[in-house]
């Protein structure tokens, strides 16, 4: 790859235009911040490929790395890549902006890192400080990269002076994630117990032969010591376990239990903590809310879910209209309560292919010897609308009537529309909505009945047409929350000898 000008560092004037050229034996491309800026690519007669990147109206924000690379490095011997660094000194740009990934620097070990504060002018003097600190830190600075060194867990800022003003960078946060050579895990048989029950905790260390365990726990602070038992899990190499067992827990045993493990050879240590709650008596608590009105769609399956916390494990019952529900042999109802965490439960009632008869008042009751809770809701079965009848008639009055009847739940609403040009409807011409218009061309009368047994509404609507002078396509559309249905009839004038 050949780059012109060769660099490796260029200082360009603000507002100027500059041309970078890269050529190679295979297609080449310029890259800037992992993207390909607009550029002109060409192939010469001698088979050489080139790419020309024209930088116009340069600002300080154009400062940074530019790479020329082969467009497709597959099949090439090396992934050759040429790097060029451009500075555009710009007094209006202090430090180049950083994204969040650059401002927060996480480490897992003591290693050299770079605080990437960069300026647009290589002549500027840049200093590193603790955030809100005045003393400059003795860390080497590279204008193309930033300050490199081994840093403590602190926040840092860079400072420079542009003209007569002091400019600060964003703060950089160095944070060391704790990764120790000892890996401790602590768990409890139960993290919630009732007073009088036992607390049992285990602390496990892997991969160390000689370790010392130290437990801290609420009882210890009051001078009542409990002797832990240390054993080896013989089925695994160097798995050492310490067991802390407190019989007949008291309310004062609630709190944080910490297992601290030290290994004296390399002076490594690690600790883990777990919270234990001792409750006076058991509890059942609902989590979140379930609306008092729930919906299900006819012939579809519906799962109703209740989330709650409880200790000890409760009994869960479901009722419909005060009658106990159980898993039906026909597979129409499925009940399940699962333990999603130590004290959290999800109880589900699944209605398979919902029927109208399954509407009603449902209650979930969760209880044990200490507490109980119940949650109730009304289940409404939604039925998609159906147009059951659309008929046209000629009363003696001379007007023509169209009657539309349909059913659904929730209550359907009705939309009448008509189309006068039968050849072009409805594809080319939108239908005209009909109703109680001021023109008195049509009148509408709608009645709604609720059928208790079927638990759905019936809508009957009659459209009166004053004078029909040519064939008319009349459409009745019923709509509700779960669907719509349409039927169409052609109304012809009295005078015409045929009807469709």
């Amino acid at each position: 790859l050949v780059v012109t000008p060769p660099g490796p560092e260029l200082v360009l004037n603000v507002s100027s235009t500059f041309v970078l050229t890269c050529s190679g034996s295979a297609p080449v491309v310029w890259e800037r911040m992992s993207q390909e800026p607009p550029q002109e690519m060409a192939k010469a007669q001698d088979g050489t490929f080139s790419s020309v990147l024209t930088l116009t109206n340069l600002t300080g924000l154009d400062t940074g790395e530019y790479f020329c690379t082969h467009n497709d490095s597959r099949g090439l011997e090396t992934d050759e890549r040429k790097r060029l660094y451009i500075f555009v000194p710009d007094p209006t740009v202090g430090f180049l902006p950083n994204d969040a990934e650059e401002l927060f620097i996480f480490l897992t070990e003591i290693t050299e890192i770079t605080i990437p504060c960069r300026v647009t002018d290589p002549q500027l003097v840049v200093t590193l400080h603790e955030k809100k600190g005045d003393v400059a830190l003795p860390v080497p600075y590279d204008h193309q990269r930033g300050f490199s060194g081994i840093f403590e867990d602190r926040s840092y800022i860079c400072k420079t002076t542009i003209g007569d003003r002091e400019v600060d960078s964003d703060a950089y946060y160095v944070y060391r994630l704790q990764v120790s050579s000892i890996n401790v895990s602590v768990n409890a048989v139960q993290t919630v117990v009732r007073q009088g029950e036992n607390i049992t905790l285990m602390c496990i260390v892997i991969g160390n032969e000689v370790v010392n365990f130290e437990w801290t726990y609420p009882r210890k602070e009051s001078g009542r010591l409990v002797e832990p038992v240390t054993d080896f899990l013989l089925d695994m190499p160097y798995h050492i376990r310490s067991i802390l067992h407190i019989p007949s827990a008291e309310l004062e045993d609630s709190g944080t239990y910490t297992c601290n493990v030290t290994e004296s050879v390399n002076d490594h240590q690690d600790e883990k903590a777990i919270n234990i709650t001792v409750v006076e008596s058991g509890y059942v608590r609902l989590l979140g809310e379930v609306g008092t009105l729930q919906f299900a769609e006819l012939h579809r399956s519906r799962t109703l879910q209740v989330v709650f916390e409880a200790y000890p494990p409760p009994t869960v019952l479901w009722f419909k209209d005060n009658r106990t529900l159980g898993d039906s042999s026909a597979g129409e109802i499925a009940l399940s309560t699962r333990n999603v965490s130590e004290t959290r439960y999800v109880s589900e009632l699944t209605l398979v292919r919902v029927k109208v008869a399954e509407a009603g008042h449902y209650t979930m009751r969760a209880f044990h010897e200490d507490a109980e809770v119940q949650l109730s809701f009304q289940l409404q079965i939604n039925v998609p609308v159906r147009v059951l009848e659309l008929s046209e008639s000629h009363p003696d009055s001379g007007e023509q009537t169209v009657r539309c009847r349909g059913r659904g739940m929730p209550q359907p609403n009705i939309i009448w529309s008509a189309c006068r040009d039968l050849k072009r409807c409805p594809r080319e011409l939108p239908p005209t909505l009909l109703g109680n218009s001021s023109e008195e061309e049509s009148q509408l009368e709608t009645n709604v009945t609720y059928w208790e047994e079927e638990q759905e509404f019936e809508v009957v609507s009659t459209l009166r047409l004053q004078h029909v002078d040519r064939p008319l396509s009349v459409r009745c559309t019923l709509r509700n929350a779960v669907g719509q249905d349409t039927q169409e009839v052609i109304v012809v004038p009295h005078s015409l000898p045929f009807k469709v």
Partner: antibody, heavy 127, light 107 residues
Framework: QVQLVESGGSLVQPGGSLRLACTAS????????MSWVRQAPGKGLEWVAN????????YYVDSVKGRFSISRDNAKKSLYLQMNSLRVEDTAVYFC????????????????????WGQGTTVTVSS | DIQLTQSPSTLSASVGDRVTITCRAS??????LAWYQQKPGKAPNLLIY???TLESGVPSRFSGSGSGTEFTLTISSLQPDDFATYYC?????????FGQGTKVEIK
């Protein structure tokens, strides 16, 4: 040099609307989460809402959900709080704050607090 | 929502005293807790984040400790500039909650 300046507070009637603005300077605004925090007269601090760098995530305290809307314009280095259906209990000094939420580390979130605050703007809801 | 309860609500102390303020969370928040100082008519000022990390520029007489549900802010030797209201604040899945505040006043 790092600064947040709020504006837009005023006296408004219950049910009315107001739009607060917060203008940032001295830092890369587009790299930070931002929050609104309020303080009723003589009372403590209450977090109201926050917004991620590119507006993909917004969170609100329950009492303002559906009434308040947080937004930002990174090009203008500005944060906004649109407040509708205002209630007497929304009367407070409203602060904007820079919220130090680093990018996620695996499944682990970190948090370094709200390190830069504005001087506050007063919203009074009264008939 | 996670509730934070600070105690005491008011604390009377003298210059040079060692002062401890407690913040309890209604459920475990690991160490996602920050402490702020606020003076009348001013915006809050971050003192400590991640339960125990001192914010840059904050005097070393301030320290924080705790994890899970119980946290403390300690001022080792109270200075005249420290008479103010102190708030704890938790972070959990991007929502925030503040404690009700502890006013440190001159005895």
């Amino acid at each position: 040099q790092v600064q947040l300046v709020e504006s837009g507070g005023s006296l408004v009637q219950p049910g009315g609307s107001l739009r607060l603005a917060c203008t940032a300077s001295g830092f890369t605004f587009s790299s930070y989460w931002m929050s609104w925090v309020r303080q009723a007269p003589g009372k403590g601090l209450e977090w109201v809402a926050n917004i991620q760098q590119d507006e993909n995530e917004k969170y609100y305290v329950d009492s303002v959900k559906g009434r308040f809307s947080i937004s930002r314009d990174n090009a203008k280095k500005s944060l906004y709080l649109q407040m509708n259906s205002l209630r007497v209990e929304d009367t407070a000094v409203y602060f904007c704050a820079r919220d130090l939420v680093p990018p996620r580390q695996g499944d682990y979130y970190h948090y370094f607090g709200m390190d830069v605050w504005g001087q506050g703007t007063t919203v009074t809801v009264s008939s | 929502d996670i509730q934070l309860t600070q105690s005491p609500s008011t604390l009377s102390a003298s210059v040079g005293d060692r002062v401890t303020i407690t913040c309890r969370a209604s459920q475990s928040i690991s160490d996602w807790l920050a402490w702020y100082q606020q003076k009348p008519g001013k915006a809050p000022n971050l003192l400590i984040y991640k339960a125990s990390t001192l914010e840059s520029g904050v005097p070393s007489r301030f320290s924080g400790s705790g994890s899970g549900t119980e946290f403390t802010l300690t001022i080792s030797s109270l200075q005249p500039d420290d008479f103010a209201t102190y708030y704890c604040q938790q972070y959990n899945s991007y929502s925030r909650t503040f404690g009700q505040g502890t006013k440190v006043e001159i005895k």
